[in-house]
C-alpha cells in the first residue's frame, strides 16, 4: 500500500510540475516556486532539461536561469549543456522525499 501511495504522489508531483512549467514565466508565483526548486535541488525540467523545449513561452535553446550551475542573468539563453543541471526535478526531488518523508 505504501508503494502505491508513493507512486501516486510521484505521479501527482510530475503532473503538477509540468503544469507549472506551462505557466512559466507568465505567472510570477509559479515562476518563483519552480525557480526555487530547480536552484535548490540543482535540477532542470521535470524529466530533464529538454522538457523546456516544449514550453511555448520559452524561446528555442533557452532554459530558466535557475537551471544554470552558476546562476547569472541570461545564463539560460543559448545555454551550453555543460553549464546547466541536466537531471530532472521529479526524480531528484522524489528521491529526496523518499529519503526524508
Amino acid at each position: 500500500a505504501g508503494y502505491v501511495f508513493r507512486d501516486k504522489v510521484m505521479s501527482e508531483f510530475n503532473n503538477n510540475f509540468r503544469q507549472q512549467m506551462e505557466n512559466y514565466p507568465k505567472n510570477n508565483h509559479t515562476a518563483s516556486i519552480l525557480d526555487r526548486m530547480q536552484a535548490d535541488f540543482k535540477c532542470c525540467g521535470a524529466a530533464n532539461y529538454t522538457d523546456w523545449e516544449k514550453i511555448p513561452s520559452m524561446s528555442k535553446n533557452r532554459v530558466p536561469d535557475s537551471c544554470c550551475i552558476n546562476v547569472t542573468v541570461g545564463c539560460g539563453i543559448n545555454f551550453n549543456e555543460k553549464a546547466i543541471h541536466k537531471e530532472g526535478c521529479v526524480e531528484k526531488i522524489g528521491g529526496w522525499l523518499r529519503k526524508n518523508v
Partner: antibody, heavy 118, light 108 residues
Framework: QVQLQESGPGLVKPSETLSLTCTVS????????WNWIRQSPEKGLEWIGY???????NYNPSLKSRVTISVDTFKNQFSLKLNSVTAADTAVYYC????????????WGQGTMVTVSS | EIVLTQSPGTLSLSPGERATLSCRAS???????LAWYQQKPGQAPRLLIY???SRATGIPDRFSGSGSGTDFTLTISRLEPEDFAVYYC?????????FGQGTKVEIK
C-alpha cells in the same frame, strides 16, 4: 507577502562611502536577483546592479569602479556600498527584486533619500 | 547602452479616455525584455507589464503592453482617477539595464 525595507544614513559627506542595507521579510532571499536602483531629478531612474544568493554580481559600468553589493543569507539582507561619493550621488535609493524568469522588478522597497553634502 | 525614449513627455486626458504611451529603444531589446512601471509622488515604481506584454500580478486588465524589437506601447483602455501618474519603460535584456525618462499622464 514579501516586503523590502531600505535602511542607512540619510546624509553622507563628499568623498565618503554610502552604505545601505535592504532587509527582505515575508519570503526567502534565494532564487531571485536582488537589485539596487536610484532616482534623481537629474538622471531619472538608474539601475546600479544586482546580486544573486551565490554572490554573483553585475554592476552598471558607469558605477562599477565604486560599487560593491553583498548578501547576507542568514539575515535575509543585501547591502550596497558606493565609495567616493559626490553631490551627483544624491538620490532616492531603492532595493528591488527580480525573479529568475526575468519578470522585471516586481517588488520594490519604499526608497530612502540619501543626500551627499558637507 | 540602450537608450529608451518615451513619448509624449506629458499626456493630458480625462477619466474614461484611452491613453497610449510610446517607448522607443535605440537598438533592439533582447527577448522583448521590456517592462512598464507606474509611479506616484512619494512612492516607489510599481510593475505593470513585463516581457513587453505580460501583466504583473494584481494589475487590472485595462493595462496592456505590446510591441517588439525597438518599438513598444503601453495602453490604458479607460483611465481611472487612480491612473494619473508617471509611467516609465525599462529594458532588462542587455546590461546595463536602462529606464526611459517617463511620461506623465495628467488630468485634463
Amino acid at each position: 507577502q514579501v516586503q523590502l525595507q531600505e535602511s542607512g544614513p540619510g546624509l553622507v559627506k563628499p568623498s565618503e562611502t554610502l552604505s545601505l542595507t535592504c532587509t527582505v521579510s515575508g519570503g526567502s532571499i534565494s532564487s531571485y536577483y536582488w537589485n539596487w536602483i536610484r532616482q534623481s531629478p537629474e538622471k531619472g531612474l538608474e539601475w546600479i546592479g544586482y546580486i544573486y544568493i551565490s554572490g554573483t554580481t553585475n554592476y552598471n559600468p558607469s558605477l562599477k569602479s565604486r560599487v560593491t553589493i553583498s548578501v547576507d543569507t542568514f539575515k535575509n539582507q543585501f547591502s550596497l556600498k558606493l565609495n567616493s561619493v559626490t553631490a551627483a550621488d544624491t538620490a532616492v535609493y531603492y532595493c528591488a527584486r527580480m525573479g529568475l524568469g526575468r519578470e522585471a522588478f516586481d517588488i520594490w522597497g519604499q526608497g530612502t533619500m540619501v543626500t551627499v553634502s558637507s | 547602452e540602450i537608450v529608451l525614449t518615451q513619448s509624449p513627455g506629458t499626456l493630458s486626458l480625462s477619466p474614461g479616455e484611452r491613453a497610449t504611451l510610446s517607448c522607443r529603444a535605440s537598438q533592439s531589446v533582447s527577448n522583448n525584455y521590456l517592462a512598464w512601471y507606474q509611479q506616484k509622488p512619494g512612492q516607489a515604481p510599481r510593475l505593470l507589464i513585463y516581457g513587453a506584454s505580460s501583466r504583473a500580478t494584481g494589475i487590472p486588465d485595462r493595462f496592456s503592453g505590446s510591441g517588439s524589437g525597438t518599438d513598444f506601447t503601453l495602453t490604458i483602455s479607460r483611465l481611472e482617477p487612480e491612473d494619473f501618474a508617471v509611467y516609465y519603460c525599462q529594458q532588462y535584456g542587455s546590461s546595463p539595464w536602462t529606464f526611459g525618462q517617463g511620461t506623465k499622464v495628467e488630468i485634463k
